[in-house]
Interface confidence: medium
């Protein structure tokens, strides 16, 4: 921050440390980054709002992350650009403190959201049987609220009230920084809490996720070729469920039966997010079942999400029972990390030849699943998840490390780092908010399609885009 007095004048003339063309360049680059950050994060938020297929627990975390990143794109980036190009803080001490509080609270909330996502993925992989049951919208909301409240408690009071605690404001009018940062040791302490600790935790968690994925790939390789099918025959269920009034499976149907199939834990409990599109859609399987069902003589097919219903034995009686063949992942809307093995159930029918037809359908489905896989086997999905996880971790480390390394150096050598380097380092932390939508959302097919619809103003059927 290069401020100087004008020699011809007694008043302090604060001048920009940059030449005109440099100012234009900085404003253009910073403005573009701010715009991309705003658009990217708004797209994530709107996509989740308008597309019901994106309204999963995992994406609620992304929504919170996008909120934090959007605030950074709107306020933090632009005010810091103004501060950088002018060379001093022109908006007074109150706005300065409010900006700093917002900046640090939101940046910390962004990091905490990344931590939540990391823990969520970790538990999805390491506790596939118990965690999904606890993983409700309410629990997600509580975790998100905790991230924001904790960030606020950590930063806002200290930033806003430090001057009153020590009894004097030592920050000059044209300057804007956190007053307690005058102490390099305090700065380093906050860097540990805000960066080094989260990085260590995230690295350890992702290492565990990666290890769990690799061990599953090895297991898959050892298993017989039959198990390489998208739907392993040993995991296909054909069971009779007592019908209820809604012609839907009764209360025992839900998450529980999906936990252990044929006496063993599901084979492929992949975390959702970046393979959500592929996992949840099971489009090939749905089509195959439709074909099986339509080959039967008197059928009526209704397709909704992952369910193919086949009404058998038409009856004039409104209350006549139907057979429903349900295929695909059996996960409630809120959940997105439960095992992804396809299950097939045959829901009871008391119509003519009902049992017979159920058996035929069930047999045909089992037969269908034994056919060679057209899709890539699960290991490729595992690799994809691990790769995405690595990308996310690297994006965070690459963007946040330079500034925090400078803070570390600064503890031992104050004048070693030029102002320009500080500015670039500080900006890189902001750029993490630009990268996040790409890292977390663009690797998801449903997100990508929804983005495309939104950008091209194709609002028709956007709520059901898969």
């Amino acid at each position: 921050m290069n401020n100087s007095t004008n020699s011809s004048n007694n008043s302090l003339a604060l001048t920009s440390p940059y030449k005109t063309f440099e100012v234009v360049f900085i404003v253009l680059v910073a403005g573009s980054l701010s715009l991309v950050t705003i658009i990217g994060n708004i797209l994530v938020m709107v996509s989740i709002k308008v597309n019901r297929h994106l309204q999963t627990v995992n994406n609620y975390f992304l929504f919170s992350l996008a909120c934090a990143d959007l605030i950074i794109g709107v306020f933090s980036m632009n005010l810091y650009t103004l501060y950088t190009v002018i060379g001093y803080w022109p908006l007074g001490p109150v706005v300065c403190d409010l900006w700093l509080a917002l900046d640090y609270v939101v940046s910390n909330a962004s990091v905490m959201n990344l931590l939540i996502i990391s823990f969520d993925r970790y538990f999805c992989v390491t506790k596939p049987l118990t965690y999904p049951v606890k993983r409700t919208t309410k629990m997600a909301g509580m975790m998100i609220a905790a991230a924001w409240v904790l960030s606020f408690i950590l930063w806002a009071p200290a930033i806003l009230f430090w001057q009153f605690i020590v009894g004097v404001r030592t920050v000059e009018d044209g300057e804007c920084y956190i007053q307690f940062f005058s102490n390099a040791a305090v700065t380093f302490g906050t860097a540990i809490a805000a960066f080094y600790l989260p990085v260590i935790i995230m690295t350890v968690l992702y290492w565990h996720i990666s290890r769990a994925s690799k061990s599953r790939i090895k297991k898959d390789k050892k298993e017989p070729v039959a198990n390489q099918d998208p739907v392993s025959p040993s995991l296909v269920q054909g069971r009779i469920v007592k019908p209820n009034n809604n012609n839907m499976p009764s209360s025992d149907d839900g998450l529980e039966h999906n936990k252990i199939q044929n006496g063993k834990a599901p084979r492929d409990p992949v975390t959702e997010n970046c393979v959500q599109g592929e996992e949840k859609e099971s489009s090939n399987d749905s089509t195959s079942v439709s074909a099986v069902a339509s080959n039967m003589r008197d059928d009526e097919i209704t397709q909704d999400e992952n369910t193919v219903s086949t009404s058998l034995g038409h009856s004039k009686d409104e209350n006549s029972k139907q057979t429903c063949i349900r295929i695909g992942t059996k996960t409630p809307k809120s959940d997105s990390c439960t095992p992804t093995n396809t299950t097939v159930e045959v829901v009871g029918s008391s119509g003519q030849n009902g049992d017979e037809k159920q058996n035929i359908v069930a047999r045909k489905i089992v037969k269908m699943t034994k056919q060679p896989a057209k899709k890539k086997p699960p290991p490729s999905r595992e690799k994809k998840v691990t790769r995405t996880i690595l990308a996310i971790l690297l994006a965070f480390i690459i963007t946040w490390a330079p500034y925090n390394v400078m803070v570390l150096i600064n503890t031992f050598c104050a004048p070693c780092i030029p102002n320009t380097v500080w500015t670039i380092g500080y900006w890189l932390c902001y750029i993490n908010s630009t990268i996040n939508p790409a890292c977390y959302a663009l690797c998801n097919a449903t997100f990508k399609k929804t983005f495309k619809h939104l950008l091209m103003c194709h609002y028709k059927n956007i709520g059901a885009t898969r």
Epitope: M1, N3, E172, P415
Partner: nanobody
Framework: QVQLQESGGGAVQAGDSLRLSCAAS????????MGWFRQAPGKEREFVAS????????QYADSVKGRFTISRDDAKNTVYLQMNNLKPEDTAVYYC??????????????WGQGTQVTVSS
């Protein structure tokens, strides 16, 4: 903002002494490292002397070592440059400089308007 006002300059003979003062209107004078620079006609501005914010460390240009002494009085928000055994080559405009180094933000750099020192032989 921090305003710096130099005083004490003037015209002297070679071998004489002068004491320059720089008064700072700063909220936190104690957190600033203070320095003196000079600029002779037709030449670049050059470093003369500096004193750390705590007053424990001082630095001097080789050309003034042993002749000039920098000191500070935090109670008065003032920094001094005691110049002894002045030489004609010391003729220049002397500028006061205040630098506050903030971890995570970089330097805040302020300059005074300068005071003229003329040494004749």
């Amino acid at each position: 903002q921090v305003q710096l006002q130099e005083s004490g300059g003037g015209a002297v003979q070679a071998g004489d002494s002068l004491r320059l003062s720089c008064a700072a209107s700063a909220r936190s004078f104690v957190s600033y490292a203070m320095g003196w620079f000079r600029q002779a006609p037709g030449k670049e501005r050059e470093f003369v002397a500096s004193i750390s914010w705590s007053g424990t460390m001082t630095q001097y240009a080789d050309s003034v070592k042993g002749r000039f002494t920098i000191s500070r009085d935090d109670a008065k928000n003032t920094v001094y440059l005691q110049m002894n055994n002045l030489k004609p080559e010391d003729t220049a405009v002397y500028y006061c400089n205040a630098v506050k180094y903030i971890p995570g933000r970089g330097e805040y750099d302020y300059w005074g308007q300068g005071t003229q020192v003329t040494v004749s032989s």
